[in-house]
């Protein structure tokens, strides 16, 4: 009996560790700033790091600039996108900018898409002012399905903050679907 | 064998217990007002409560102004920072201020800050504006490891607003590493 | 033995997979558009959807408003409010805006009510300009006993989004109180 | 209660100097802009400019700009004022004062006078 | 800079008889949603005392026949009862912009 007991613990353990990591994708994903989109107009921004600094994936895929799950589940998905301008770096088009971020789900059987959270603010950036910074965090827990892509769009990508601890976005499952 | 199937019920029961528990440290940590540095310089904040109102922690330490990793996993960490003045309490040094957080990481093996998440925003707070008000929120998902350190350093220290709902940061861990 | 085995093998399915279920409530819930408040005072909004769109409840209660809390334990609290004022709309009463939200907790046994977290800015919406808009998130982990509620109060409720991706709130639970 | 303290009188001739102070207690200094006003004799208010002790920002009037320096020392809760290549039309009282909580100058030194002379 | 321009430049009331002085800005004192003017009463030898702060507000102490109005760039200070000890010099203020600006003054005599 203490053999099969030893046998039933160990079988148990495997499956309650692999049940675990099944169980719980992750992404954080950070902005890769040598393919930025210039201009003002809302894009979809296609180029994220997912593996060196904090950026980081497991369980998910990152392809075509889209975060890709795969497995069903109830994530909870992030967001966090900072914007800034220096005088050094050149006027800007326009003072009155609109600063936004969008988290998207498409679905490659219905390809359509559909904004799941949305933030930002408009802002009124002087040209007498030296220095302007401006960061948008964005989080809300959603259903998602095997093969339902996640990505970010954003106005004025050209104003972006490439830094890793400025532009990023992430999901983390927390549930299975019952 | 009925004795033996308790048993190992048992022992499966504590064992999914503790490990659960083990596994899921935590911690919210709000303002300590009373402690607050003065000035408009970038410091860091040391005094934090954990045991009052909704502070809390638990498997994590606080210590020396920051909360430190007992137990190697990731982490979803965030933190809400808010400023505000009133002309009752005097007058602002500036209109123009850049109001920021930054929430870094430091390892005691290797003796060096990083920062994780960044947020905030420059800000005109004219003074002729009986209030002023401004919040930052960023959150995002890390690997940390035991003994590694967690800090939240803001600019304009002495513009932050010292309730518990208002400025806090905190921590709870999601899943092992593999 | 073998037989007696699978019974344990079973039976811990099934205990695994019904406590990982009652041990994970959860809510998203967004703005009923149908029923905002007006006026620019700070009021409880009390219309909020949970199951049409992207919002969704699982072993919680939405009622009379309020987020009703069926489990103890320890959960991930967020909200995101967005505002926005475009000139064809009507003219603001004011042109300063103190736009601000706050995430309260109720106990029943104690009618009292506790903000848990604020969040917002002051803001100057100059009538020259077009179109406004600024969100604020808010998140933070706290621990909820059985029959607790929460709710969202918001300043300037007439201003509020009424999207989906834009104004909602939810819960979900990370682990169990000890 | 807020009370602001200054120096006493100064004869000067025309070309000289003068460095008065005003000492501030009974409210952090650091916090408010502390504001300089001079009266000629018979004449109107003038305000001059404003030092914001903390990190030491000044704001001054285009007109003394060229020969007006405001400045403090925090250890001592003292705002000081120099006013250079004096000219017999500087002959003043000039006041430091600081706003009330919410506005308007509601705290006054009382006064130093100043008198230039040949 | 704003010009602050104050009349009468002085003016002789009897004592119980109400009196009114008028500060005109060359351009708008008022900013969010307020109005950046206040009034300063000096009798001879003494600094300035607060009368009036931001356009109509009693300053704490200020005895309750004093009162303020206007808004924008004109702006009113009125005495409604005047006594003796009211015999002074009264100056307008403005602090809505760098540089601060007062009033050339109004020199109030008692019948």
């Known amino acids: 009996i203490r053999a099969e007991k030893a046998m039933v613990d160990g079988s148990w353990l495997d499956l309650a560790k692999r049940s675990k990591l099944e169980a719980q994708p992750f992404a954080h994903l950070t902005i890769n700033a040598t393919d930025i989109p210039s201009g003002s107009h809302k894009v979809s921004l296609s180029s994220w790091y997912h593996d060196r600094g904090w950026a980081k994936i497991s369980n998910m895929t990152f392809s075509n600039g889209k975060l890709i799950v795969n497995q069903d589940g109830f994530y909870y998905l992030y967001a966090n996108i900072c914007f800034r301008h220096h005088e050094t770096s050149g006027d800007l088009a326009t003072e009155y900018l609109q600063l936004m971020v969008y988290v998207t789900k498409t679905s490659i059987k219905i390809p359509s898409s559909h904004t799941l959270m949305k933030g930002g603010s408009t802002k009124y950036w002087s040209g007498n002012s030296e220095f302007h910074f401006y960061s948008i965090n964005v989080g809300g827990f959603f259903k998602l399905r095997s093969g339902e892509e996640i990505s970010i769009e954003v106005s004025n990508p050209s104003l972006l903050d490439p830094d890793q601890d400025a532009t990023y976005f992430g999901a983390f499952k927390v549930r299975d679907i019952d | 064998i009925r004795a033996e199937k308790a048993m190992v019920d048992g022992s499966w029961l504590d064992l999914a217990k503790r490990s659960k528990l083990e596994a899921q440290p935590f911690a919210h940590l709000t303002i300590n007002a009373t402690d607050i540095p003065s000035g408009s310089h970038k410091v860091s904040l040391s005094s934090w409560y954990h045991d009052r109102g909704w502070a809390k922690i638990s498997n994590m330490t606080f210590s020396n102004g920051k909360l430190i990793v007992n137990q190697d996993g990731f982490y979803y960490l965030y933190a809400n920072i808010c400023f505000r003045h009133h002309e009752t309490s005097g007058d602002l040094a500036t209109e123009y201020l850049q109001l920021m957080v930054y929430v870094t990481k430091t390892s005691i093996k290797i003796p060096s800050s990083h920062t994780l998440m960044k947020g905030g925003s420059t800000k005109y707070w004219s003074g002729n504006s009986e209030f002023h008000f401004y919040s930052i929120n960023v959150g995002g998902f890390f690997k940390l490891r035991s003994g590694e350190e967690i800090s939240i350093e803001v600019s304009n220290p002495s513009l932050l607003d010292p309730d518990q709902d208002a400025t806090y940061f905190g921590a709870f861990k999601v899943r092992d590493i593999d | 033995i073998r037989a007696e085995k699978a019974m344990v093998d079973g039976s811990w399915l099934d205990l695994a997979k019904r406590s990982k279920l009652e041990a994970q409530p959860f809510a998203h819930l967004t703005i009923n558009a149908t029923d905002i408040p007006s006026g620019s005072h700070k009021v409880s909004l009390s219309s909020w959807y949970h199951d049409r769109g992207w919002a969704k409840i699982s072993n919680m209660t939405f009622s009379n408003g309020k987020l009703i809390v069926n489990q103890d334990g320890f959960y991930y609290l967020y909200a995101n409010i967005c505002f926005r004022h475009h000139e064809t709309s009507g003219d603001l009463a004011t042109e300063y805006l103190q736009l601000m939200v706050y995430v309260t907790k109720t106990s029943i046994k104690i009618p009292s009510s506790h903000t848990l977290m604020k969040g917002g800015s002051t803001k100057y919406w100059s009538g020259n300009s077009e179109f406004h808009f600024y969100s604020i998130n808010v998140g933070g982990f706290f621990k909820l006993r059985s029959g607790e509620e929460i709710s969202i109060e918001v300043s300037n409720p007439s201003l509020l989004d009424p999207d989906q991706d834009a104004t909602y709130f939810g819960a979900f639970k990370v682990r169990d109180i000890d | 209660q807020v009370q602001l303290v200054q120096s006493g009188a100064e004869l000067k001739k025309p070309g000289a100097s003068v460095k008065l102070s005003c000492k501030a207690s009974g409210y952090t200094f650091t916090t408010y802009w502390l504001q300089w006003v001079r009266q000629a004799p018979g004449q109107g208010l003038e305000w001059m400019g404003a030092i914001y002790p903390g990190p030491g920002n000044t704001k001054y009037t285009q007109k003394f700009k060229d020969r007006f320096t405001i400045t403090a020392d925090k250890s001592k809760s003292t705002a000081y004022m120099q006013l250079n290549s004096l000219k017999s039309e500087d002959s003043a009282v000039y006041y430091c004062a600081r706003r009330g909580s919410r506005r308007g100058i509601a705290y006054w030194g009382q006064g130093t006078l100043v008198t230039v002379s040949a | 800079n704003i010009v602050l321009t104050q009349s009468p430049a002085s003016l002789s009331v009897s004592l119980g008889q109400r009196a009114t002085i008028s500060c005109r800005a060359s351009?708008?004192?008022?900013?969010?949603?307020?109005?950046?003017m206040h009034w300063y009463q000096q009798r001879p030898g003494q600094a300035p005392r607060l009368l009036i702060y931001?356009?109509?507000n009693l300053e704490s102490g200020v005895p309750a026949r004093f009162s303020g109005s206007g808004s924008r760039t004109d702006f009113t200070l009125t005495i409604s009862s005047v006594e003796a000890e009211d015999e002074a010099t009264y100056y307008c203020?403005?602090?809505?912009?760098?540089?601060?600006?007062f009033g050339g003054g109004t020199k109030l005599e008692i019948k």
């Open positions: 203020q403005q602090d809505n912009e760098d540089p601060y600006t």
């Open positions: 351009e708008s004192v008022d900013s969010y949603g307020r109005s950046f």
């Open positions: 931001l356009a109509s």
